[in-house]
Interface confidence: low
């Protein structure tokens, strides 16, 4: 069958790296500077991205695949194959439409990509907070009150927290 | 703000460097574009370079005759062989990074350009 | 190489009125198109971005819309100040898309 098929459409043929050339009967040519054919078969070859700008070459096009790209520091990727960079902000903060704001009081973000979350609500679990919460780190739970000690008390809970995924503008 | 200078009357086949200076923000931060705009014609873009990485990018009639470089607080424009045809007033532009994707960029931050006239 | 082409090169309508711009990209250029004003003596002014978002102090009355390869800028209720030249953009730098020009060739708007 393979026979047959390759008798029938010559360009099948053809191995990745290369392209069947209508213009010169149909034979196998190379892949020209700065594109690629990743499967055999190809009638034309596909221009290789270029990592522009923010985006950085993480492997470079050859004739039979792609380049590849990630972020400059500063930057992380975001989207299938990287199709963004986003930038980074610091622990404490989150990337709004504005830039970096720092976390609103009650939530935290322990990463330089991402939203500010809430603060665990240690009453849910009926615990109390052992370590106070900040702009970098969800607050420690610890036991129950009435697990504690006689004469020991727990630090104030937080402020109930607002909604996940709102970010300050 | 950005600041075009260096435009001034030369004879063709005299080389020309165009400087573009930013005050109010830092270079390294953001992508700058070179762009032309010949007397009564439409804008043509030259090229641009990322001041995070210095890479650069030009037009394929540019490349070869026009070099961009950066320094932490200007933009270079570097012009060889200069014939009638690149007659022009020439823009600097500084990105502003849009929708949160920073895979894209329009301009928003423009130079009052500088004029090139090049004849004999 | 991917070709920003515009259409009208020159419109003309009265105070008050509505002109269109199209502008249309030799291949899909997804929606990361822009829209500039520029008058005589001036440097561009970016009034849109992304097919759609006005940018900071750009009226309402510019708007942008299509997608992939068809974009167009409708300004209404024109105004004596919105006489300019217009520009399309194309900006999809991500991709492997290359631009020998990435503006189209410009629409004069004239207001009687």
């Known amino acids: 069958f393979e026979r047959t098929r390759s008798l029938q459409d010559p360009c099948s043929n053809c191995p990745a790296g290369t392209f069947c050339d209508n213009n010169r009967n149909q034979i196998c040519s190379p892949c020209p500077p700065n594109s690629f054919s990743s499967a055999g078969g190809q009638r034309t070859c596909d221009i290789c991205r270029q990592c522009k700008g923010v985006f950085r070459t993480r492997k470079e096009c050859s004739s039979t695949s792609n380049a590849e790209c990630d972020c400059t520091p500063g930057f992380h990727c975001l989207g299938a194959g990287c199709s963004m960079c986003e930038q980074d902000c610091k622990q404490g903060q989150e990337l709004t439409k504005k830039g970096c704001k720092d976390c609103c009081f009650g939530t935290f973000n322990d990463q330089k990509r991402g939203i500010c979350r809430p603060w665990t609500n240690c009453s849910l679990d009926g615990k109390s907070v052992l370590v106070n919460g900040t702009k970098e780190r969800d607050v420690v739970c610890g036991p129950s009150p009435a697990d504690l000690s006689p004469g020991a008390s727990s630090v104030t809970p937080p402020a109930p927290a607002r909604e996940p995924g709102h970010s300050p503008q | 703000s950005v600041e075009e200078s260096g435009g001034r009357l030369v004879t063709p086949g005299t080389p020309l460097t165009l400087t573009c200076t930013a005050s109010?923000?830092?270079?390294?931060?953001?992508?700058m574009i070179w762009v032309r705009q010949a007397p009564g014609e439409g804008l043509e873009w030259i090229g641009d370079?990322?001041?995070?990485?210095?890479t650069t990018d030009y037009a394929s009639w540019a490349k070869g005759r026009f070099t961009i470089s950066k320094t932490s607080t200007t933009v270079d424009l570097k012009m060889t062989s200069l014939t009638t045809e690149d007659t022009a007033t020439y823009f600097c532009?500084?990105?502003?990074?849009?929708?949160?994707?920073?895979?894209?960029?329009?301009?928003?931050?423009w130079g009052q350009g500088t004029l090139v006239t090049v004849s004999s | 190489d991917i070709v920003m082409t515009q259409t009208p090169a020159s419109v003309e309508a009265a105070v008050g009125g509505t002109v269109t711009i199209k502008c249309q990209a030799s291949?899909?250029?997804?929606?990361?198109l822009a829209w500039y004003q520029q008058k005589p003596g001036q440097p561009p002014k970016l009034l849109i971005y992304?097919?759609?978002t006005l940018e900071s102090g750009v009226p309402s009355r510019f708007k942008g819309s299509g997608s992939g390869t068809e974009f167009t800028l409708t300004i209404s209720d024109l105004e004596s100040a919105d006489a300019a030249t217009y520009y399309c953009?194309?900006?999809?730098?991500?991709?492997?898309?290359?631009?020998?020009?990435?503006f189209g060739g410009g629409t004069e708007v004239v207001v009687k």
């Open positions: 532009a500084r990105a502003r990074y849009s929708g949160g994707s920073y895979a894209n960029y329009v301009f928003n931050l």
């Open positions: 109010g923000f830092t270079i390294s931060s953001y992508h």
């Open positions: 370079i990322y001041g995070g990485t210095a």
């Open positions: 291949q899909s250029i997804s929606s990361y």
């Open positions: 992304r097919t759609s």
């Open positions: 953009q194309g900006y999809d730098w991500s991709s492997s898309n290359r631009y020998d020009n990435t």
